[in-house]
Each structure stands twice: as structure tokens, then as C-alpha cells.
Interface confidence: low
């Protein structure tokens, strides 16, 4: 399904990278890992060296939005987390540089970052009812809630 039409005329301008090299762990303490060139998955790791390290870039909305809008990039790469549809895996999209401006269908690169205590949620800007989620026996995907796990802990300074 296409991104929500009311978002199509909103412009998002890149501000700066706000976090470098952090790990995302879900509520089952599974870390997000690379499954292959295209997809992510989650696994219980003994060694966090295997976990994906992310950078988080902040964007400012042209409409006065109180939400923090971010892009997620795999550290030291040009791969960006990209939303598809509900229950579809998020993709890793290669781009030569971080987009300076994002609008329209490109909003599948953006997520609203919300925190509640130690819980972090990433809602798709293109699909505001759907979250980045882990799911048993599946890839990291977009989901509306249970049985998928939508809350993450951010682990920083794991180097």
C-alpha cells in the first residue's frame, strides 16, 4: 500500500547524526543481526560482535512535528533500513549518501522514534500505525503489535 497521502507533501530535512554504533535488542533480549544482503533478523547472541551496529540520523519536518524523525543506517556502510508493507521484512537499501531531503514515497526511509523509559519504538513515517518489529522465525519487519515484538532497548558504547 502507498504511504499515507496526508504525509506526501511533508518535507523532512536532514539535521545531523545523533547516535553512532548502537545495538538494538528486543524485549526477548535478542539482538538485530544481518541475515543476508537484504534482510535483518533477531537472534540471542553470546557475542555482541555479531550484532548490527546502527547510526541514527535526525530529520526536521516542514510541519511543526513534535515527534523525533530518524533514519537508521548500518554503521560504516551505506545501507539504510527501509520500510515495506505490514508483515513484510524491512529492507536494507544502499544509497551513496544520507538523503538531505526526504519527501513523498521516500518516507519509507524514516521512522518516528519514541521512548518510554528504556523502551524504544520506531514507527514508520510511511505507515504510522506500524512499527519496526521482530517476529519469531522471521525477519525484522513492520508490524502493528503482538505477536511481533515492537519495543527495543538501545545499547550504546559496545565497541
Amino acid at each position: 500500500s502507498a504511504p499515507f497521502s496526508f504525509l506526501s507533501n511533508v518535507k523532512y530535512n536532514f539535521m545531523r547524526i545523533i547516535k553512532y554504533e548502537f545495538i538494538l535488542n528486543d524485549a526477548l533480549n535478542q539482538s538485530i543481526i544481518r541475515a543476508n544482503d537484504q534482510y535483518l533478523t533477531a537472534a540471542a547472541l553470546h557475542n555482541l560482535d555479531e550484532a548490527v551496529k546502527f547510526d541514527m540520523g535526525a530529520y526536521k519536518s516542514s510541519k511543526d512535528d513534535a515527534k523525533i524523525t530518524v533514519i537508521l543506517r548500518i554503521s560504516k556502510t551505506q545501507l539504510y533500513v527501509t520500510a515495506q508493507d505490514e508483515d513484510q521484512p524491512v529492507l536494507l537499501k544502499e544509497m551513496p549518501e544520507i538523503p538531505k531531503t526526504i519527501t513523498g514515497s521516500e518516507t519509507n526511509l524514516l521512522f518516528f522514534w519514541e521512548t518510554h523509559g528504556t523502551k524504544n519504538y520506531f514507527t514508520s513515517v510511511a505507515h504510522p500505525n506500524l512499527f519496526i518489529a521482530t517476529k519469531q522465525d522471521y525477519w525484522v519487519c513492520l508490524a502493528g503489535g503482538p505477536p511481533s515484538i515492537t519495543d527495543f532497548q538501545i545499547l550504546e558504547n559496545q565497541a
Epitope: 543476508n36 537472534a43 547472541l45 553470546h46 555479531e50 522465525d137
Partner: antibody
Framework: QVQLVESGGGVVQPGRSLRLSCTAS????????VHWVRQAPGKGLEWVAA????????YYAESVKGRFTISRDNSKNILFLQMDSLRLEDTAVYYC???????????????WGQGTLVTFSS | DIQMTQSPSSVSASVGDRVTITCRAS??????LAWYQQKPGKAPKLLIY???NLETGVPSRFSGSGSGSDFTLTISSLQPEDFATYYC?????????FGGGTKVEHK
């Protein structure tokens, strides 16, 4: 070269247990997810179970969940399949097979063992 | 779980024939599909992965196509050593599954 050698098959009675082993050589065993696939006589292939490279993640077909346990010993390069509460429909040749490096479980299986047969006594 | 349906279950063909086998997934699996060849008493052999990539050492007469839920394995010119059973396998879900197989036999 990559080698996978299954052992432990044999004749067993329904309801009993059996433990299959698969000994790996020719590659760094601890970097690969590994699988068990079975084939009943004259039938097609059925994926049974898989375990991630470090043993932390395990996956099972619905037909064996709760009865079979997959495990591995990376220090000895051995994959195991503990089969409990065996049923007549578990009669098959059991193959171990290798996936891609590191954590990938959903993978094409490029290397297979020769298989070990599990049958039942009447 | 994802169900894989192969057709036909058997096909009679002669050396030199073009043979086509189809595989359908019960849900979309992008290009996460592999094809195997198995001969009696032997372990399966990987032919094609990710729908269309030829495994190293596999003759170019084998080709794969498709994405989403419908896939095809084609043998452009059947050779004597190609008489065997062929299986598709989805590698999209962590719970792998195979198609029921297609036996290619002598006409």
C-alpha cells in the same frame, strides 16, 4: 573439501528414542547454521530442524516440535538430533545439510551428508 | 508455515527436450527459492538459489525464474544425466519447506 557424515540410524521401536550425529569436516563448522532434512521411503524431502552457527537459535518443523531436539558441539564439529517418542511416520533417511556462514538459517543447502536410515521393528 | 506446490508431479521427456517445472508458494517469498536435483539413493544437489542464480558447477542448461509466489525451473535441452527428481525449497521463512517433487522420466 566439505564433508558431512551422519551416523546413529538403525532399527527402533515406536515410542523409543534415538540420537543421530553428523560429523563435519573441511570447513569451519562454528560459522555455519546446519539442518536436518528427512526423506521417507519413496517420498519427498521434509525439512526437520535447524540450529544457528552458535547453537543459540533452534527451529523445528511442526511435525517434530516437542519430540526432537537439535543441538551442536562446535568444539567437536558435531551436529545432533535427539529423537524422542518416535512414531512410525518418522521412518526416513535423515540427512544433515549446511547452510550459509554465520547466523543465516533460511538458506539454500549446498552441502549434504549421505544420510542415515531410521526404521522401525514390527 | 509456507506451503510449496510443485507441478507436474512427473513429466515424461526425451533427451534434447525442453523441460519446465513450476513451483508455487502459498504466500509471497520474493526471490527466496532454491531448486535441487536428486537421483535415487543419493543426497539432493543444489542447482539454483535465490530463484535464478546458478550454483557453481551446474550446467548452464539449467535456469530458474520467477519471484513472489510463482517460480519455474527450465532444462533447455535434457541430457541423459538429467533424469531425476527435482525439488523446490523456499528460503524465505526460518521454517524451511520443500515442494513435493517432480520426477523427470524417460518417455
Amino acid at each position: 573439501q566439505v564433508q558431512l557424515v551422519e551416523s546413529g540410524g538403525g532399527v527402533v521401536q515406536p515410542g523409543r528414542s534415538l540420537r543421530l550425529s553428523c560429523t563435519a569436516s573441511g570447513f569451519t563448522f562454528s560459522m555455519f547454521g546446519v539442518h536436518w532434512v528427512r526423506q521417507a521411503p519413496g517420498k519427498g524431502l521434509e525439512w526437520v530442524a535447524a540450529v544457528s552457527y552458535d547453537g543459540s537459535n533452534k527451529y523445528y518443523a511442526e511435525s517434530v516440535k516437542g519430540r526432537f531436539t537439535i543441538s551442536r558441539d562446535n568444539s567437536k564439529n558435531i551436529l545432533f538430533l535427539q529423537m524422542d517418542s518416535l512414531r512410525l511416520e518418522d521412518t526416513a533417511v535423515y540427512y544433515c545439510a549446511r547452510g550459509r556462514p554465520k547466523v543465516v538459517i533460511p538458506a539454500p543447502l549446498a552441502h549434504w551428508g549421505q544420510g542415515t536410515l531410521v526404521t522401525f521393528s514390527s | 508455515d509456507i506451503q510449496m506446490t510443485q507441478s507436474p508431479s512427473s513429466v515424461s521427456a526425451s533427451v534434447g527436450d525442453r523441460v519446465t517445472i513450476t513451483c508455487r508458494a502459498s504466500q509471497g517469498i520474493s526471490s527466496w527459492l532454491a531448486w535441487y536435483q536428486q537421483k535415487p539413493g543419493k543426497a539432493p544437489k543444489l542447482l539454483i538459489y535465490e530463484a535464478s542464480n546458478l550454483e557453481t558447477g551446474v550446467p548452464s542448461r539449467f535456469s530458474g525464474s520467477g519471484s513472489g509466489s510463482d517460480f519455474t525451473l527450465t532444462i533447455s535441452s535434457l541430457q541423459p544425466e538429467d533424469f531425476a527428481t527435482y525439488y523446490c525449497q523456499q528460503t524465505s521463512s526460518f521454517l524451511l519447506s520443500f515442494g513435493g517433487g517432480t520426477k523427470v522420466e524417460h518417455k
